[in-house]
């Protein structure tokens, strides 16, 4: 019946029989063995009925035996309850008393065990874990239960097995059985395919910047399966990452900061049981210079009737290799002073009295000048000359 689970394939030991061959011509009747002797090494297979949740014990004998009080049909004892002992008295006309008393130690129900895949998803690309789980309680002595696994040519006598250092994306077959008092009562087979492995490292072909705000990276994809790329670019402590389509082999980086070193890392990844990132390929470049931003917080203050003190704060973005501050002083449209300092601190002396001046301060980074900060200021009349004149009157 389909309801039966074949729960065993144990080796059957044939019942021992002996024949005495007489050397005389007198006909003698050979003596029969006792049934206890004849069936001393009888073995049993247990078959489980999923619907009734009862076992049938199949007696491994060559002839149809009788079972005393217990009825047995075709050498099968039916309706055995899990984890209960049943005594069977075995007899046959080929043997004499005493009968063989066989104690049937019935195993736990088959559905109380489940073969569980205990592989950690993070390690599922190179490991397999299988474990028998008891999903319901039973009264059988667990000491009498043994577990066996065979995966390829490896055999394990454990309830749980771990196979390591496997190849990703490979199929592995494991057969397992559970024995109760050395009688197999259930088995299971699992074919497990290891997960996708981490993709390989992309091969960067070139990585460079030919402008102040742009850079380019090109690469060859890795050999192994992958879904997409992650490109990260790091400047100082700032990190930006982009998700790139798997078919890309080039990416143009935009809106970069001028005269800045960028470290790029490119890795492929695959979304499998978990996301697996491949090794990152690294490269770096420095963007070209650009005009610096404007100096700020510029002040022009009078230190005398015809002297000024000009100060400013550095630009927020230098955008180049060097640091130099320039001050241009104009009267009307005529350039009257042009000074350059390491710091934005200028003392402008000996200007014309009572004159309107325009002060233009800007930063130069060695490659480009920045936009000037412009302030207007007027010198005073010569108060000393005025006092001197006043004194004479």
């Amino acid at each position: 019946s389909d309801a039966y689970l074949n729960a065993s394939e144990t080796t059957t030991l044939s019942p021992s029989g002996s024949a005495v061959i007489s050397t005389t011509t007198i006909a003698t009747t050979p003596s029969k063995p006792t049934c206890d002797e004849k069936y001393a090494n009888i073995t049993v297979d247990y078959l489980y009925n999923k619907e009734t949740k009862l076992f049938t014990a199949k007696l491994n004998v060559n002839e149809n035996v009788e079972c005393g009080n217990n009825t047995c049909t075709n050498n099968e004892v039916h309706n055995l309850t899990e984890c209960k002992n049943a005594s069977v008295s075995i007899s046959h006309n080929s043997c004499t008393a005493p009968d063989k008393t066989l104690i049937l130690d019935v195993p736990p129900g088959v559905e109380k065990f489940q073969l569980h895949d205990c592989t950690q998803v993070e390690k599922a690309d190179t490991t397999i874990c299988l474990k028998w789980k008891n999903i319901e309680t039973f009264t059988c002595d667990t000491q009498n239960i043994t577990y066996r696994f065979q995966c390829g040519n490896m055999i394990f006598d454990n309830k749980e097995i771990k196979l390591e250092n496997l190849e990703p994306e490979h199929e592995y077959k494991c057969d397992s059985e559970i024995l109760y008092n050395n009688h197999k009562f259930t088995n299971a087979s699992k074919i497990i395919k290891t997960d996708f492995g981490s993709p390989g490292e992309p091969q960067i072909i070139f990585c460079r910047s030919e402008a102040a705000h742009q850079g380019v990276i090109t690469w060859n994809p890795p050999q192994r399966s992958f879904h997409n790329f992650t490109l990260c670019y790091i400047k100082e402590t700032e990190k930006d990452c982009l998700n790139l389509d798997k078919n890309l082999i080039k990416y143009d980086l935009q809106n970069l900061k001028p005269y800045t070193k960028y470290v790029l890392s490119l890795h492929a990844y695959i979304i499998a049981k978990v996301q697996r990132n491949g090794s990152a390929a690294m490269c770096h470049f420095t963007t070209k210079s650009a005009p610096p931003s404007q100096v700020w917080n510029m002040t022009v203050s009078m230190t005398s009737d015809n002297s000024m003190h000009v100060k400013c704060r550095p630009p927020r973005d230098r955008n180049g290799p060097h640091e130099r501050y320039h001050l241009e002083v104009e009267a009307g449209n005529t350039l009257v002073r042009n000074e350059s300092h390491k710091n934005c601190d200028f003392r402008v002396k000996d200007l014309q009295y009572s004159t309107d001046y325009t002060f233009k301060a800007y930063f130069h980074n060695g490659d480009y000048p920045g936009e000037p900060f412009i302030l207007h200021h007027s010198t005073s009349y010569n108060s000393k000359a005025h006092h001197h004149h006043h004194h004479h009157h």
Epitope: M298, G332, D356, S378
Partner: nanobody, 124 residues
């Protein structure tokens, strides 16, 4: 603080002229420059022209260069804005402003004193 009073606004045809005046009183000796700003409806206030009080140097926004002239009369503590070849886009409220003293530029943050404004309307 300097007190400022504008006058001279009004309605004029496109291509016509107007002359605005701004009389200053109070601490006029502390100001280094005076100027004109304007604000059209729904727009931000913008610089028009300025004049250095002592030296008389003049400065103009690109949009009015060649059409407007700023001048001053120190004896009257007054500045003027002569507006020629007026266009409809010159329509705005015109403000007179004076600097706080010290260095200055065209941005309104350098101007600490402001008049109430005089309305100029240029019809097409």
């Amino acid at each position: 603080q300097v007190q400022l009073q504008e006058s001279g606004g009004g309605l004029v045809q496109a291509g016509g002229s107007l002359r605005l005046s701004c009389a200053a009183s109070g601490r006029t000796f502390s100001t280094h420059a005076m100027g004109w700003f304007r604000q059209a409806p729904g727009k931000e206030r913008e610089f028009v022209a300025a004049i250095a009080w002592s030296g008389g140097s003049t400065y103009y926004a690109d949009s009015v260069k060649g059409r407007f002239t700023i001048s001053r009369d120190i004896s009257k503590n007054t500045i003027y804005l002569q507006m020629n070849s007026l266009k409809p886009e010159d329509t705005a409220l015109y403000y007179c402003a004076a600097t706080n003293g010290g260095a200055w530029h065209y941005h309104e943050r350098y101007f600490g004193s402001w008049g109430q404004g005089t309305l100029v309307t240029v019809s097409s």
